[in-house]
């Protein structure tokens, strides 16, 4: 006679919360005589899931009619799956015995794992801004997914990044898992308009990955380049000092004019022009009257950008010897 085989064709069954799960089990022989029971887990602590002869199993139904004499299909359907239902299910053949039935053979088992989608990835940037050529870290987090296998990729402006580290927790068996990945990005001066994207692919997403993004504008500080020029005015006794602050980001910038070390004007950048790369330019003017100056004037422009240390740029306005003579005459 043919030896009994217990066939559980699925090694793994992925089921979403609330769905029904069908656990398949067929036998190759009607002998020996005795019932087929379903258990979750192995060993003495295993949990009885279904016994046709006795017990109450309201969420379990059989796929075939087990009362038929030649039935060889012992598949069951469990309704309204919850996270507590995860585990490995075994169909087990018992041989009729007295006073008790004796376990004869077990199927290989079907692992039921919850199929849960990962949450939308959340990307967070560094706590403080950094300047171009420096490296900043971005973190991507997603949670609540199952099974554990997941793929995460990083992109900057659509180009894949390679410098990142990813962890999936917990390491062992769990109802659901979370992923955390940190990517390192080297900032370029034109990255104000750049974007980093974290892409998560999972079996539950049917090939349509989830994405989270962060703007590098939140992470970058582009310090200004400074240029000071002077132009004599038509009147002859006035000089127009032009101070150009170029290619800075973010836009919070304060400019202080000092004449021989004394503050003569403080401005906050307002009417800015925006460059194509997202940085800003600003021009400030100061009209200096040289007619009442006896000595050379040291004009200093102090720029404080985004709470950083002030940067100074000075210009010496030379008063002509003729003016010096006139000034000294005026003091007698």
């Amino acid at each position: 006679e043919e030896e009994l085989q217990m066939i559980q064709p699925e090694k793994l069954l992925l089921v979403a919360v609330g769905e029904s799960a069908t656990l398949n089990c067929t036998v190759t022989s009607l002998l020996p005589v005795g019932p087929v029971l379903w258990f979750r887990g192995v060993g003495p602590g295993r949990e009885l899931i279904y016994n046709q002869k006795e017990g109450h199993f309201p969420r379990v139904t059989t796929v075939s009619d087990l009362t038929k004499r030649n039935n060889m299909d012992f598949s069951i359907r469990i309704s309204s799956i919850t996270p507590a239902d995860a585990g490995t299910y075994y169909c087990v053949k018992f041989r009729k015995g007295s006073p008790e039935n004796v376990e004869f053979k077990s199927g290989p088992g079907t692992e039921m794992a919850l199929r849960a989608k990962p949450s939308a990835p959340v990307v967070s940037g560094p706590a403080a801004r950094a300047t171009p050529e420096h490296t900043v870290s971005f973190t991507c987090k997603s949670h609540g997914f199952s099974p554990r296998d997941i793929t995460l990729k990083w992109f900057k402006n659509g180009n894949e990044l390679s410098d990142f580290q990813t962890n999936v927790d917990p390491a062992g068996q769990s109802v659901s898992y979370s992923i955390r990945s940190t990517a390192r990005v080297v900032l370029a001066p034109w990255d104000v308009r750049s974007q980093v994207t974290c892409e998560v692919a999972h079996v539950t997403l049917q090939g349509d990955p989830l994405r989270g993004t962060a703007n590098l504008s939140e992470a970058i500080r582009v310090p200004p380049t400074l240029e000071v020029t002077q132009q004599p005015m038509r009147a002859g006794n006035q000089v127009n000092i032009t101070y150009q602050v170029r290619n800075f980001y973010p836009q919070n910038l304060q400019l202080t004019w000092l004449e021989n070390g004394n503050v003569c004007r403080t401005e906050t950048a307002s009417t800015l022009t925006e460059n194509k790369d997202g940085t800003y330019n600003w021009t400030s003017w100061l009209l200096v009257n040289t007619s009442d100056q006896r000595d050379d004037v040291v004009l200093t422009c102090q720029v404080k950008h985004d709470g950083q240390l002030a940067v100074n740029k000075s210009l010496v306005l030379e008063v002509s010897a003729h003016q010096k003579d006139q000034s000294s005459d005026a003091t007698h």
């Epitope: 659509g158 034109w190 990255d191 104000v192 308009r193 022009t273 925006e274 460059n275 790369d277 997202g278």
Partner: antibody
Framework: QVQLVQSGAEVKKPGASVKVSCKAS????????IHWVRQAPGQGLEWMGW????????NYAQKFQGRVTMTRDTSINTAYMELNRLRSDDTAVFYC???????????????????WGQGTMVTVSS | DIQMTQSPSTLSASVGDRVTITCRAS??????LAWYQQKPGKAPKLLIY???SLETGVPSRFSGSGSGTEFTLTISSLQPDDFATYYC????????FGQGTKLEIK
């Protein structure tokens, strides 16, 4: 799909102003600069300037500075181009166009224009 | 300002012909050049960017080459749909277009 839809044709008198709209759909409006290009009848294409819909920042071609104003309304994904003090030689088709990429891949940050509106004919005549 | 000069201004050709349009820049623009096709009453359509990259959905009979100051647009086998005006555009320093080349049926 990604598209830019412009307002209808306009007839204006010399000295008047015209405001052309350009409604974006199918993509993130604030992610890409919008440019304006004009084309006089039987002539070539002339770049007028751009607007960054995210910040509202603009840059105008020297020729149009002081006469053109580009604005946007992010709540309705629409960019506008207003040209003042119209002359008869401003008679042209005005196009809005979107850049191919929404980021900078090089210092100048300039890029080609791959999505165009259908054009708005503006006729300036007394 | 960078000037762009296209030649020829008008080109007569037949279906199946191989045609070449040239664009010259007044100074080096590296590879920052695009080619557009425009039909009467329609908006320009991007064909080639970065001198030689084919825009998505554009037939492979269109190709671009060149760098620095000399650029060409080639149509390997002219189709009835290709009769139009073609413009080159530099985007190395702001934006300037060539004056256009009208491709007409011989």
């Amino acid at each position: 799909q990604v598209q830019l839809v412009q307002s209808g044709a306009e007839v204006k008198k010399p000295g008047a102003s015209v405001k052309v709209s350009c409604k974006a759909s199918g993509y993130t409006f604030t992610g890409y600069h919008i440019h304006w290009v004009r084309q006089a009848p039987g002539q070539g294409l002339e770049w007028m300037g751009w607007i960054n819909p995210n910040s509202g920042g603009t840059n105008y071609a020297q020729k149009f500075q002081g006469r053109v104003t580009m604005t946007r309304d992010t709540s309705i994904n629409t960019a506008y181009m207003e040209l003042n003090r119209l002359r008869s030689d401003d008679t042209a088709v005005f196009y809005c166009a979107r850049e191919r990429v929404g980021y900078c891949s090089r210092p100048s940050c300039l890029d080609d224009l791959n999505i165009w509106g259908q054009g708005t004919m503006v006729t300036v005549s007394s | 300002d960078i000037q762009m000069t296209q030649s020829p201004s008008t080109l007569s050709a037949s279906v199946g012909d191989r045609v070449t349009i040239t664009c010259r820049a007044s100074q080096s623009i590296s590879s920052w050049l695009a080619w557009y096709q425009q039909k009467p009453g329609k908006a320009p359509k991007l064909l080639i960017y970065k001198a030689s990259s084919l825009e998505t959905g554009v037939p492979s009979r269109f190709s671009g080459s060149g760098s620095g100051t000399e650029f060409t647009l080639t149509i390997s086998s002219l189709q009835p749909d290709d009769f139009a005006t073609y413009y080159c555009q530099q985007y190395d320093s702001y934006y300037t277009f060539g004056q256009g080349t009208k491709l007409e049926i011989k």
